[in-house]
Amino acid sequence: VLPRWRQQWSGSGTTSRFPETVLARCVKYTEVHPEMRHVDCQSVWDAFKGAFISKYPCNITEEDYQPLVKLGTQTVPCNKTLLWSRIKDLAHQFTQVQRDMFTLEDMLLGYLADDLTWCGEFNTFEINYQSCPDWRKDCSNNPVSVFWKTVSRRFAETACGVVHVMLNGSRSKIFDKNSTFGSVEVHNLQPEKVQALEAWVIHGGREDSRDLCQDPTIKELESIISKRNIRFFCKNIYRPDKFLQCVKNPEDSSCLSGI
């Protein structure tokens, strides 16, 4: 039997054992989070699958993910949302210690999809494990990109109080308007609910004592936020290692000095 022709994309294919991974993550999440125990993981997988299976992987819309978003509805308490840009690992290390703060990946839908890749093929029920569209080289409306855009928008829309964002001070653009934070989340914070955005700029070098809150891209962020009438604050985190240590042990004498 001749193998059926398959579209060749520039990006890596669907993560191996994708359905099993999503289902297992869902079960684990609902066991650990009592408020989500009512969630039926099989329905979640069916909704996830329904968003991209049999669809042309360059023509996925936010609408495709709405059934999944509905099933994964979750609220974060006011003042407890942590956004991040280009510094995922530290943000996740932080929320693992500061358990009452939440990144998108601490929520069910973000947890399910974190670090995974997936796509299907038009008119077949198969998952494409060989290749998936690359955002730059192929198309932006691919299953993975649209998923993160959809859930990031929703995460930002539901945030309230003081919202925090962790930014990577080692990058040339500390605030990048083309990042998910810069292109989606910033614009979907609701001024009626969000009083302020507080940026934590994480320094890379041990000897870096510059005030990165004065960086031009941070001022650009403030400019965007100010038009939406949301207050903006910024803090330098000069020593991320010490920062995490002090979150774990706030009573430590060294934590009374600056971080």
Epitope: K177, P191, K219, E220, S223, S226, R228, N229
Partner: antibody, heavy 118, light 109 residues
Framework: EVQLLESGGGLVQPGGSLRLSCAAS????????MNWVRQAPGKGLEWVSS????????YYADSVKGRFTISRDNSKNTLYLQMNNLRAEDTAVYYC???????????WGHGTTVTVSS | QSVLTQPPSASGTPGQRVTISCSGS????????VNWYQQLPGTAPKLLIY??QRPSGVPDRFSGSKSGTSASLAISGLQSEDEADYYC???????????FGGGTKLTVL
């Protein structure tokens, strides 16, 4: 004294080009988003274009998109507006104005007049 | 046709209180900063109100308010030097643009 001073206006034929400049003084130009706003004779204010602090992104009114280009040189404290393929309806006084976070356009120049006519 | 809607004219006698309205939508006035500008005859516009507050140097006779998708400018104790054009403006999230009202010509009778 905080000041914005526009120059480069004049009479130009339809289809022609002009480059407006706006020299800033008395404030840290590189800390502000900048704008061009115009006012046709006897009409109201119309926003034309904005440029971010670093110049890395720009916005345009639909009426000028593809014809006008906003730029800035932070080392020279100067804002520019390159206007190509000018039309009669572009005839206006062109003002440059800064955007101060949480305030709005708080410093305006006196304006430079652009007349597009054959 | 302006995105923000203002009455074309308003008038009052000296000492009176006058209000100018500005109507928009959720993507501009509804969620964003609202400004009011005063333009005296033959001069450049001047920032009068930002987010219902006055910049320094603007008399407290001028005040701004906002409710839902509408904003208004109130001038109490009207004076002859208040005769000018008044414009509301806001950033519009949908258009990625500053939008202005058509302007209101205030006449002091």
């Amino acid at each position: 004294e905080v000041q914005l001073l526009e120059s480069g206006g004049g009479l130009v034929q339809p289809g022609g080009s002009l480059r407006l400049s706006c020299a800033a003084s008395g404030f840290t130009f590189s800390d502000y988003e900048m704008n061009w706003v115009r006012q046709a004779p006897g009409k109201g204010l119309e926003w034309v274009s904005s440029i971010s602090i670093t110049g890395s992104w720009t916005y345009y009114a639909d009426s000028v998109k593809g014809r006008f280009t906003i730029s800035r040189d932070n080392s020279k404290n100067t804002l520019y507006l390159q206007m190509n393929n000018l039309r009669a309806e572009d005839t206006a006084v062109y003002y440059c104005a800064n955007y101060k976070s949480y305030y709005g356009m708080d410093v305006w120049g006196h304006g430079t007049t652009v007349t597009v006519s054959s | 046709q302006s995105v923000l809607t203002q009455p074309p004219s308003a008038s009052g006698t000296p000492g009176q209180r006058v209000t100018i309205s500005c109507s928009g939508s959720r993507s501009n006035i509804g969620t964003n900063l609202v400004n009011w500008y005063q333009q005296l005859p033959g001069t450049a516009p001047k920032l009068l109100i930002y987010n219902v507050q006055r910049p320094s140097g603007v008399p407290d006779r001028f005040s701004g308010s906002k409710s839902g998708t509408s904003a208004s400018l109130a001038i109490s104790g009207l004076q002859s030097e208040d005769e000018a054009d008044y414009y509301c403006a806001a950033w519009d999230d949908s258009l990625n643009a500053w939008v202005f009202g058509g302007g209101t010509k205030l006449t002091v009778l």
